[in-house]
Structure formats: structure tokens, C-alpha cells
Amino acid sequence: VEIYTSGALEAVNGTDVRLKCTFSSFAPVGDALTVTWNFRPRDGGREQFVFYYHMDPFRPMSGRFKDRVVWDGNPERYDVSILLWKLQFDDNGTYTCQVKNPPDVDGLVGTIRLSVVHTVPFSE
């Protein structure tokens, strides 16, 4: 399994953001597919659970991401993205996307470094 993410992402406080994670695999996607999203705060601290998918999406029932994260993936498109809304400054940190698609061997974990800012400078 190979995992692809945007690497780094900047988003404005209070808005919603799609944490995009896609993958490739020699094995067809089936019921064995599992996806785990975790978060490590920028200021350190322990890793926190964000989301889990296995045939169905499983949102966190408690913690900082409760009621703020939903599945926006599509296994047929090898897409295991999630949507995080109402961004807060303490959402700054590294999000990891881990995909298992047996019988393919596990790949590296995909990472997204999210920076939550007051405003995004217009750079076009």
C-alpha cells in the first residue's frame, strides 16, 4: 500500500477542512480495508484518536473531535479522506492516515501537517 496526502495544509480558524488521503494497492479494495486517523498536537502531548473506518465509518464518541469529524472517503476511488469542521487553533498539529488493505502489505503512514491561522494570505 502506498499512501498520498497533501503533506502540509493551512486553514482558517472556524472553517472546515478536508484532510485528503488517498492510496494505491495491488489488492482490490474489499471488506478487509481498514483506515485509522490519529492526531498529534503541535505542542507535543500524546497521540489522539480521530477516526476509524472498517466497512462503515466510526466517529469518536468523546474527546476533542467528537461531533467535528466525518468520513468523506470513497473506497472505490481509493480515497480515505475525512472532513474536520469548526477548526480551532489547538487543532494545529500532525494528522496521520494509516491504511490496511489485506493481502497487500502495510505501507507507510501518510501525514498532514495542519496549520490553523487567523486568515490565509491571498497568494494568487
Partner: antibody, heavy 114, light 107 residues
Framework: EVKLVESGGGLVQPGGSLKLSCAAS????????MSWVRQTPEKRLEWVAY????????YYPDTVKGRFTISRDNAKNTLYLQMSSLKSEDTAMYYC???????WGQGTSVTVSS | SIVMTQTPKFLLVSAGDRVTITCKAS??????VAWYQQKPGQSPKLLIY???NRFTGVPDRFTGSGYGTDFTFTISTVQAEDLAVYFC?????????FGGGTKLEIK
């Protein structure tokens, strides 16, 4: 086989309301973001709404914001689009689509005219 | 909102020809671009997603490429059944937007 079947279209006067439905089958409906897209008589495509899984957060372009409401009933595997304060420029074929457009229904026609 | 400028509007080709359609985004959309085929009287069908990935069951004569603002869709060897309108779409940022379409006609 993924199947999306829209219904509820018709002729409505300007200022009127209409509710479209989309019956989904062949996949786990509750696990997918769902969208409505319309195609004008000039064949231009315009995305009009989408709704997430889970808590059902919704997104609209400015052209329909405040007038259209997308909703879903996961128990019935059905997507809805409530349209109010309709204008002549809302005349179009309305399609329901799975996720970000990987499967589309056959469409239901909406005509806004007096 | 992001404008997707699609060219050309019309293409008249012979079976066996190679066809290229381009789409230019008004700002970067990463690789969040899809290409659709709409045959007469039918709804659009997804051919390419994430700029270069063929969707399930799509023949390999259809390919896509590009990143950022410039995207290309190619039919390597046009067949009579490819008569259709082709649209590009960005879903990088809301509102998702479509190109104006390219009508492909076969001589």
C-alpha cells in the same frame, strides 16, 4: 450495482417550492457524502448542494444558499432537496450524485415558469 | 469561486484520431479534477478522478494528466461510441465548478 433514482420534478411558478427525492441502492448510503448537481437548458453543469455523512453538514453555492436545503434519511436510503423561492434561472435537470460525482442518477426535470 | 476554462468547445474528428481537451483553473486546485462523459440523452459518467486516475470500468484509451492549474484529457484512439460532451470539474474548493464542456462529433 449502484443505482440513484430521482423524482419530484415538475412545473412550478416563480416563488414556488418543490421537493426532490433521490432513492439510493446498491451501496451503503450512510457511508457516502451525497450531492445534487443541475444542468441548465444550455447544458451548463452547476453543483447545487452536498451533505456529509454522519451529522450531515451541508454546503451550498451562493446562487442557492438560503433557498435550497439538502437533507438525507439514512434509514430510507434517500436524499432530498427542498427548493423554495424558485426563480426562472433554477430551471434545469437535477441530478443526484454519490460522493464527489462517481455515480449519477438519470435526473428529474424542474421548470420554473408562469 | 474557481473558474474552469475548457477548450475547445467543439471537436470534429474521425474514428481512430487522437483527441486532447484542456482545462485551465483560475487558481491552483492541486489534482482535484475530474473528467465526465455525457452521451446524448444520458446523465454524466465519471471517467477520470484526481486528474489522472481512471474510474472503475473505464477503457484505457481515456487518460488524464495535470496538476495545479493546467489539466489535459486525452482519448488516444477515438471510437464511434465516444460521441459525447466531455466536462472537467474541480472539487478542490467549494463551490465545486465545471468547465463549459467539449462536444465531440465523429465525421
Amino acid at each position: 450495482e449502484v443505482k440513484l433514482v430521482e423524482s419530484g420534478g415538475g412545473l412550478v411558478q416563480p416563488g414556488g417550492s418543490l421537493k426532490l427525492s433521490c432513492a439510493a441502492s446498491g451501496f451503503t448510503f450512510s457511508s457516502y457524502t451525497m450531492s445534487w448537481v443541475r444542468q441548465t437548458p444550455e447544458k451548463r453543469l452547476e453543483w447545487v448542494a452536498y451533505i456529509t455523512t454522519g451529522a450531515g453538514r451541508t454546503y451550498y453555492p451562493d446562487t442557492v444558499k438560503g433557498r435550497f436545503t439538502i437533507s438525507r434519511d439514512n434509514a430510507k436510503n434517500t436524499l432530498y432537496l427542498q427548493m423554495s423561492s424558485l426563480k426562472s434561472e433554477d430551471t434545469a435537470m437535477y441530478y443526484c450524485a454519490r460522493h464527489r460525482g462517481d455515480y449519477w442518477g438519470q435526473g428529474t426535470s424542474v421548470t420554473v415558469s408562469s | 469561486s474557481i473558474v474552469m476554462t475548457q477548450t475547445p468547445k467543439f471537436l470534429l474528428v474521425s474514428a481512430g484520431d487522437r483527441v486532447t481537451i484542456t482545462c485551465k483553473a483560475s487558481q491552483s486546485v492541486s489534482n482535484d479534477v475530474a473528467w465526465y462523459q455525457q452521451k446524448p440523452g444520458q446523465s454524466p459518467k465519471l471517467l477520470i478522478y484526481y486528474a489522472s486516475n481512471r474510474f472503475t470500468g473505464v477503457p484505457d484509451r481515456f487518460t488524464g494528466s495535470g496538476y495545479g492549474t493546467d489539466f489535459t484529457f486525452t482519448i488516444s484512439t477515438v471510437q464511434a461510441e465516444d460521441l459525447a460532451v466531455y466536462f472537467c470539474q474541480q472539487d478542490y474548493s467549494s463551490p465545486w465548478t465545471f468547465g463549459g464542456g467539449t462536444k465531440l462529433e465523429i465525421k
